[in-house]
């Protein structure tokens, strides 16, 4: 079943290559388990950046080696992507799945264009 997810259109990554934004989805109602997936679209290619599941009992938990961190509150997920470089500039799409209990719902945001500008190297100093 379809569900809407909302996310900002544009985000500028920090000089340290960190970008954060909120992904908000249609109310979870009695959803006890929610899966959030971050997808990166480059041309016609869609790749998974990271994914995490959270339950009504537990906080959002990405894998320890994930490039993403996040927190959840109700039907909002605050997502942070780390280690971005200029070549990481692209459209990042938030996908939310209300997994359990049934019925299953899925929602995709329109995407957040993340701009990453690599910092200029510091000039050598004598």
């Amino acid at each position: 079943k379809g569900m809407h997810a909302a996310q900002p259109a544009v985000v500028l990554a920090s000089s340290r290559g960190v970008a954060s934004f909120v992904c908000e989805y249609g109310s979870s109602g009695n959803a006890a388990e929610v899966r959030v997936t971050m997808l990166r679209q480059a041309g016609s290619q869609m790749t998974e950046v990271c994914a995490a599941t959270y339950t009504v009992e537990d906080e959002l938990a990405f894998l320890d080696d994930s490039t993403c961190t996040g927190t959840s509150s109700g039907n909002k997920v605050n997502l942070t992507i780390q280690g971005l470089r200029a070549m990481g500039t692209g459209l990042y799409i938030c996908k939310v799945e209300l997994m359990y209990p049934p019925p299953y719902y899925v929602g995709m945001g329109n995407g957040t264009q993340i701009y990453v500008i690599d910092p200029e190297p510091c000039p050598d100093s004598d």
Partner: antibody, heavy 116, light 112 residues
Framework: QIQLVQSGPELKKPGETVKISCKAS????????VSWVKQAPGKGLRWMGW????????TYVDDFKGRFAFSLETSASTAFLQINNLKNEDTAIYFC?????????WGQGTTLTVSS | DVLMTQTPLSLPVSLGDHASISCKSS???????????LEWYLQKPGQSPKLLIY???KRFSGVPDRFSGSGSGTDFTLKISRVEAEDLGVYYC?????????FGGGTKLEIK
């Protein structure tokens, strides 16, 4: 602390209607579904279905379609089970239970006796 | 509907013994997200059921570690090490993966 408190025992005649309540406290009522479970005398547990406390949408097991109705009074954090046109075989203990990823909290049960 | 079959029906034990209850489902109860919503409940006489184990092997808060759950697919087991008097009652397995969700028929743990 989290509690589900059900209404007291009922003695009814065949053909009558009963409405059992389940009042929740200690958590946000609309976050968790409420299921209803039947236990006939000396028998096991049977899941009857559940109601989504956010949308109000009920789901019934086939055997409990027709005479059975789940409803809510969200402002009072209360779920209801109504059984119409009671039959002798409805004699049982009825439990409500909160469900997230499990039935982690249960009501104490309401004993319904149907007898002419 | 998924049929949950528990064995044995009755399990006489001595206090301090180990106990093992089997629960078999008529089909795989792995849900679409890869999780298995298999639970174990204990109902003591005159009381409502209490959650022991969820998602096959996760102990609910406050449940002693002498209770453990295991299994996958269609075969599941609840083990109790060192049975205590407060463990006596009827144990039910339950699957919440496929609607209609279903309980097993129950296993009565009693003193030998």
């Amino acid at each position: 602390q989290i509690q589900l408190v059900q209404s007291g025992p009922e003695l009814k005649k065949p053909g009558e209607t009963v409405k059992i309540s389940c009042k929740a406290s200690g958590y946000t009522f609309t976050t968790y579904g409420v299921s209803w479970v039947k236990q006939a005398p000396g028998k096991g547990l049977r899941w009857m279905g559940w109601i989504n406390t956010y949308s109000g949408m009920p789901t019934y097991v086939d055997d409990f379609k027709g005479r059975f109705a789940f409803s809510l009074e969200t402002s009072a954090s209360t779920a209801f089970l109504q059984i119409n046109n009671l039959k002798n075989e409805d004699t049982a203990i009825y439990f409500c239970a909160r469900r997230g990823i499990s039935f982690d909290y249960w009501g104490q049960g309401t004993t319904l006796t149907v007898s002419s | 509907d998924v049929l949950m079959t528990q064995t044995p029906l009755s399990l006489p034990v001595s206090l301090g013994d180990h106990a093992s209850i089997s629960c078999k489902s008529s089909q795989s109860i792995v849900y679409i997200n890869g999780n298995t919503y298999l639970e174990w409940y204990l109902q003591k006489p005159g009381q409502s059921p209490k959650l022991l184990i969820y998602k096959v092997s996760k102990r609910f808060s406050g449940v002693p570690d002498r209770f453990s759950g295991s299994g996958s697919g269609t075969d599941f087991t609840l083990k109790i090490s060192r049975v205590e008097a407060e463990d006596l009652g009827v144990y039910y397995c339950f699957q919440g993966s496929h609607v209609p969700w279903t309980f097993g028929g129950g296993t009565k743990l009693e003193i030998k």
